[in-house]
């Protein structure tokens, strides 16, 4: 019923506005009026969409008013000013303070005028990962664990990996009522070549400016692979000392090597140096099997190389030695 | 102390108009919008209209068609209200109200009789 | 026109007793509710504002709730001084209107 032509007054408020568990948070509402137009505001009230009676009141002459005085506070109304701004800030935050909100304005002569808005109630997730070190099983399983820790929505995990696998994600209530704790699982067959590799845990969730990204180094335990490296076919005699090394790729590190042959112990042109075996030089031709057996905490392995010193023609001076 | 002072009883003719008056003390009167109320004897009450006195800006409720015109003289912080055409069934008491949303002061009342 | 019904049109009851007054709206109109009370030859007086907020200097006897569409006044232990007639008015949307009444009588 106001008069015919006037502007209208507005009233502006965000149509959402995220807070904190626990923390405060302010709901913005403003009364817009344009230049010309006069109104005059007599009271300001917050309700709640589904609950009965209003939360908060501003009166013009009685002042505020809170159905929970503690948690409720009118951020700008004061008695004797205009009332422009009837922002409400609520203290403590719950999760069931999530919800729709109204804000209204009681003006003259325009009437009522109100706005609604949604108060998002979040929780900053903690995020950890970690590495779950496995055994070569021969079938699936988690060699990474990422935790997003009391998030309020759920937060969001995925994994990034050039190693193949999938992941397996569970939710679980978290400590505080309403929040939620996000468990994935990166799963796949351990072998060596994982070893040591890293994966990527990316945990995305609306608290965060930008996902958290926590990388995992994945350890995965097995038995020495060996191998014999230092021959090359081109042995002859009367030529320098030669090496062969016992290459072992293993986890943890091997504890031991020990060399040997098929015939038995090692002859003795044949020096056992740890992962080196130093082949001194010889008068006559050999034909030899050599042995290396390393040894870690999850067992032994071992790998074989037949050696032979030949008869060279003199012009090929280089020899037995490869290094 | 908040006061709202209203002129005396009248009584009028069918088809003529009456002025009453609101007379405000205790508070600042371009603070508060004033409006009018009427009550027939023994029934309900009713809403005629408002007026802020800064502005000037009124509402009219739509029954009174034009009949009703609130104005406010800010020098001497008093409304008046003046309803034209009137008829036996405005006979009332019409009570001016300090207006907070709700209605929080209110005059004493002025009985304002129609009849031939 | 936003209609209000309240009920019932009259009552009477005894001092000490628990008075109920409801008043009903014909659409919703939040929580923008007053409730008054007007003793015989006097103008009404403002109780309750916003549907549950009681005037400073009114008795904590009386309390109002509601949103909506339906309103409640209470008078918790009822008084002699409270012989009155009780008006729910409702100031969502223009025009305003009142409840039609409650006369309450003491027994």
């Known amino acids: 019923w106001p008069p015919p032509g006037t502007g209208d007054i507005i009233v502006q408020a965000p149509t959402q506005v995220p807070g904190f568990l626990g923390d405060s948070v302010t709901l913005p509402c403003y009364l817009q009026v344009p230049g010309m137009e006069e109104t005059h505001v007599s009271q300001l009230t917050w309700s709640r969409h589904g609950e009965s009676g209003s939360m908060a009141v501003f009166h013009q002459t009685q002042g505020p008013n809170y159905s929970e005085p503690k948690r409720l506070e009118f951020v700008a109304a004061r008695l004797g000013t205009e009332l422009r701004d009837a922002s409400l800030r609520m203290f403590g935050l719950r999760v069931e303070d999530e919800g729709n909100y109204t804000c209204l304005f009681v003006t003259f002569p325009q009437g009522s005028r109100s706005v609604d808005i949604w108060l998002r109630v979040l929780a900053k997730p903690q995020n950890t990962a970690e590495v779950q070190k496995v055994q070569l099983t021969g079938k699936p399983v988690p060699v990474a664990r990422c935790v997003s820790t009391g998030g309020r929505p759920p937060a969001h995990i995925t994994w990034h990996s050039d190693l193949g696998g999938m992941p397996n994600t569970s939710q679980a209530p978290g400590f505080l009522s309403g929040t939620v704790t996000v468990t994935s699982l990166w799963i796949l067959v351990p072998s060596s070549q994982v070893d040591g590799k890293s994966v990527t845990c990316k945990v995305e969730h609306e608290s965060f400016e930008k996902p958290q990204l926590l990388t995992v180094n994945l350890t995965v335990y097995y038995p020495p692979e060996v191998s014999i490296s230092g021959y090359d076919n081109n042995w002859y005699l009367s030529q320098n000392e030669a090496t062969l090394t016992c290459d072992a790729r293993s986890n943890p590190e091997p504890t031991g090597y020990n060399w040997s042959t098929t015939m038995g112990p090692l002859p003795p042109f044949a020096v056992a140096q740890g992962a080196q075996l130093l082949i001194r030089p010889v008068d006559k031709p050999i034909n030899t099997t050599f042995i290396c057996n390393v040894t870690n905490a999850l067992g032994a392995r071992q790998a074989e190389l037949t050696v032979q010193v030949k008869e060279g023609p003199p012009s090929e001076p280089s020899g037995m030695s490869s290094n | 102390e908040v006061q709202l002072v209203q002129s005396g009883s009248e009584l009028k003719k069918p088809g003529a108009s009456v002025k009453v008056s609101c007379k405000t003390s205790g508070y600042t009167f371009t603070e508060y919008t004033m409006h009018w109320v009427r009550q027939p004897h023994g029934k309900g009450l009713e809403w005629i209209g408002g007026?802020?006195?800064?502005?000037?800006?009124?509402s009219y409720n739509q029954r009174f068609k034009g009949r009703v015109t609130i104005t406010v003289d800010k020098s001497t912080s008093t409304a008046y209200m003046e309803l034209s055409s009137l008829r036996s069934e405005d006979t009332a008491v019409y009570y001016c109200a300090r207006w907070t949303g709700d209605f929080d002061y209110w005059g004493q009342g002025t009985l304002v009789t129609v009849s031939s | 026109d936003i209609q209000m019904t309240q009920s019932p049109s009259a009552m009477s009851a005894s001092v000490g007793d628990r008075v109920t007054i409801t008043c009903k709206a014909s659409q919703n109109v939040g929580t923008n509710v007053a409730w008054y009370q007007q003793k015989p030859g006097q103008p009404p007086k403002a109780l309750i504002y916003?549907?549950?907020y009681r005037y400073s200097g009114v008795p904590d006897r009386f309390s109002g709730s509601g949103s909506g569409t339906d309103f409640t006044l209470t008078i918790s232990s009822l008084q002699a001084e409270d012989l009155a007639e009780y008006f729910c008015q409702q100031y969502e949307s223009y025009p305003y209107t009142f409840g039609q009444g409650t006369k309450l009588e003491i027994k």
């Open positions: 916003s549907a549950s």
């Open positions: 007026i802020h006195p800064n502005s000037g800006g009124t």
